[in-house]
Interface confidence: medium
Amino acid sequence: MNGRVDYLVTEEEINLTRGPSGLGFNIVGGTDQQYVSNDSGIYVSRIKENGAAALDGRLQEGDKILSVNGQDLKNLLHQDAVDLFRNAGYAVSLRVQHRLQVQNGPIGHRGEGDPSGIPIFMVLVPVFALTMVAAWAFMRYRQQL
């Protein structure tokens, strides 16, 4: 099956205030530790329970962080990116890219949010049509009596 996975990409500016235990998330990525093939970007890999990011609620695991306090995260070594976060101060502004998976393709394609891979309307439309045909046949049958 050649179902295509499309992504709805949105960007958001998230302002976090460093909490008692910091910003409260983990990252992967960097030029020396590519998380996504052909992409050395920095991605959120874990949101820590009760941390600043978790309490804010906007940052999600899988988000790509584009910049910290206006500083671009492109082409950085992993540890350099880590250090940038650690030295970012009390108020931290993150430019973040969210990727929402959208299903687009034939019936056999399995989307992340739909375990059966079949959109609900693909089931409802035939059921509705069958119901209408059965009702019409029943009415015709009654008229003949």
């Epitope: 235990s21 910003l23 983990n26 990252i27 990525g29 890999s45 329970e49 540890q79 976060f85 650690r86």
Partner: nanobody
Framework: HVQLVESGGGLVQAGASLTLSCAAS????????MGWFRQAPGKEREFVAT????????YYADSVKGRFTISRDNAKNTVYLQMNSLKPEDTAVYYC??????????????????????WGQGTQVTVS
């Protein structure tokens, strides 16, 4: 998923040395931060030492600082705890733990149990 198996525990006399090993099986061991914890009889499990995924950062509980050394060999998927100048109060079951999910932007030093995703069954160390 990561499976952790500790070995190297035993009964030793005070002042002796012991090296614990923790062999990991499963995917990408080299990206996991590793830690050692211990639980003495009748006490809560406590943090002993941790090492970052690169091996570049280590951190120790005050009670073992200068006596214990944590290290790792990513080629062998193994983390070690070298314990010198052992004391009777070091008697405990020692647990190896692994934490996935990249690097914390806050600290390399994960000292809380809840930070860790995978745990071994433990190995007994008794110092007489």
């Amino acid at each position: 998923h990561v499976q952790l198996v500790e070995s190297g525990g035993g009964l030793v006399q005070a002042g002796a040395s012991l090296t614990l090993s923790c062999a990991a099986s499963g995917r990408s061991f080299s990206t996991y931060h590793m830690g050692w914890f211990r639980q003495a009889p009748g006490k809560e499990r406590e943090f002993v030492a941790t090492i970052s995924w690169t091996g570049g950062s280590t951190y120790y509980a005050d009670s073992v600082k200068g006596r214990f050394t944590i290290s790792r060999d990513n080629a062998k998927n193994t983390v070690y705890l070298q314990m010198n100048s052992l004391k009777p109060e070091d008697t405990a079951v020692y647990y190896c733990a692994a934490r996935g999910g990249g690097t914390s932007v806050d600290s390399d030093y994960d000292v809380e149990e809840f930070e860790y995703d995978y745990w071994g069954q433990g190995t007994q160390v008794t110092v007489s």
